[in-house]
């Protein structure tokens, strides 16, 4: 939702948690802020504290309840607003109809690990964290490799369009440092987007047995 | 205190239209979805749509067939659903429903009798 | 559509007996579970909301438990006033669905 120079911008993990984001030219200093959610459907509701992120733009998290638990599906819609106190009221900045399941972001996959690992090959498996049973198999996702010399951004992205909570690094180079990342997003919902990128896993490639070409 | 009043009974030939009403009180009518609900002699509960009197939208069973429509009226909180084409295996109890988690306040039902 | 079976479909217990009523999904629905009480009447209540809240003015002695697809409405001390037909429902996906209940009688 924008009004003129405001933007409110919240994502659902599809679990217990929607991340909000406010961002504000000229925005009120010194003022108390929060994001409250209410749900057409549910009897919950709930409000976060929104904190600075940046000059302009501030961030909190809507903790609806244990992280596992679902507790919106897809026939929900929740009303999210921006209140900021004004003296002694609040004052609705910003409003949006959130539809959770339209507005997917996961969390970054975890427990990454190196299976198995060879001169040129490396096998990594990791697992996704409080994603809804909803999406059965119905998820995508993305991995990329650091190399010595090189930066992140220049690393080429591989893509798994499936369910596949593992991937085997070919062509590797013998005895030498690599870090792995992936992150993952569901199939659903029209404004749905990539999760942030795991921790790095670092992992070293065995070397080349002496006397061998390699 | 939440209190959902339905219209009376009714009896209607087959192929003709009924529309039953559902007025609310004791709460914000706009915040709460409506739900309708029958209930067929001797038979368990069929959900036959919902509506969101603070918008209009709605979802409705397709098992109905396009035969349903709900509406509401703010300005008098109630809402209204209307099942057109009846059958005799249209005959049964229909119900409004607040829902919040649940459906939380019933209506005390409207019979509905389709009969030659 | 989402299936719910109820079992047992009747039953019959003495005053002061634990009651136990069974529903089960066809699929995952999380903990979007709620059961009603409908009396001889034909008056529908909530009783139980979101697997296990206990609705305002619902006797303490009605409690529910599950996750998943299988769910179980349990009544600790049967009462004569519980004489009713049970109904579980899923609000986890349209359509919404019931169960195809289950009548309590006194013995």
């Known amino acids: 939702a924008v009004n003129g120079t405001s933007q409110f911008t919240c994502f659902y993990n599809s679990r217990a948690n929607i991340s909000c984001v406010w961002s504000q030219d000229g925005a009120l200093q010194d003022t108390s802020c929060q994001v409250h959610a209410w749900p057409d459907r549910r009897r919950w509701n709930q409000t976060c504290e929104l904190l600075p992120v940046s000059q302009a733009s501030w961030a909190c998290n809507l903790i609806l309840g244990a992280p596992d638990s679902q507790k919106l599906t897809t026939v929900d819609i929740v009303t999210l607003r921006v209140l900021c106190r004004e003296g002694v009221r609040w004052r609705v900045m910003a409003i949006q109809d959130f539809k959770p399941f339209e507005n997917l972001r996961l969390m970054a996959p975890i427990s990454l690990q190196v299976v198995h690992v060879e001169t040129h090959r490396c096998n990594i498996s990791w697992e996704i964290s409080q994603a809804s049973h909803y999406f059965e198999r119905h998820l995508e996702f993305e991995a990329r490799t650091l190399s010595p010399g090189h930066t992140w951004e220049e690393a080429p992205l591989l893509t798994l369009k499936q369910k596949q909570e593992w991937i085997c690094l070919e062509t590797l180079t013998p005895d030498t440092q690599y870090e792995f990342q992936v992150r993952v997003k569901p199939l659903q919902g029209e404004f749905t987007t990539w999760s942030p990128w795991s921790q790095p896993l670092a992992f070293r490639t065995k070397p080349a047995a002496l006397g061998k070409d390699t | 205190q939440v209190q959902l009043v339905q219209s009376g009974a009714e009896v209607k030939k087959p192929g003709a239209s009924v529309k039953v009403s559902c007025k609310a009180s004791g709460y914000t009518f706009t915040s709460h979805w409506i739900s309708w609900v029958r209930q067929a002699p001797g038979q368990g509960l069929e959900w036959m749509g919902d509506?969101?009197?603070?918008?209009?939208?709605?979802n409705y069973n397709e098992k109905l067939q396009g035969r349903v429509t709900m509406t509401v009226d703010t300005s008098t909180s109630t809402a209204y659903m209307e099942l057109r084409s009846l059958r005799s295996d249209d005959t049964a109890v229909y119900y409004c429903a607040r829902e919040r988690g649940g459906f939380d306040y019933w209506g005390q039902g409207t019979l509905v009798t389709v009969s030659s | 559509d989402i299936q719910m079976t109820q079992s047992p479909s009747s039953l019959s217990a003495s005053v002061g007996d634990r009651v136990t009523i069974t529903c089960r999904a066809s699929q995952d629905i999380s903990n979007f579970l709620n059961w009603y009480q409908q009396k001889p009447e034909g008056t529908l209540k909530l009783l139980i909301y979101?697997?296990?809240g206990l609705h305002s003015g619902v006797p303490s002695r009605f409690s529910g438990s599950g996750s998943g697809t299988d769910f179980t409405l349990t009544i600790s001390s049967l009462q004569p006033e519980d004489v009713a037909t049970y109904y579980c429902?899923?609000?986890?996906?349209?359509?919404?669905?019931f169960g195809q209940g289950t009548k309590l009688e006194i013995k």
């Open positions: 429902q899923q609000d986890n996906n349209h359509p919404y669905t």
């Open positions: 509506i969101y009197p603070g918008s209009g939208n709605t």
């Open positions: 979101y697997t296990s």
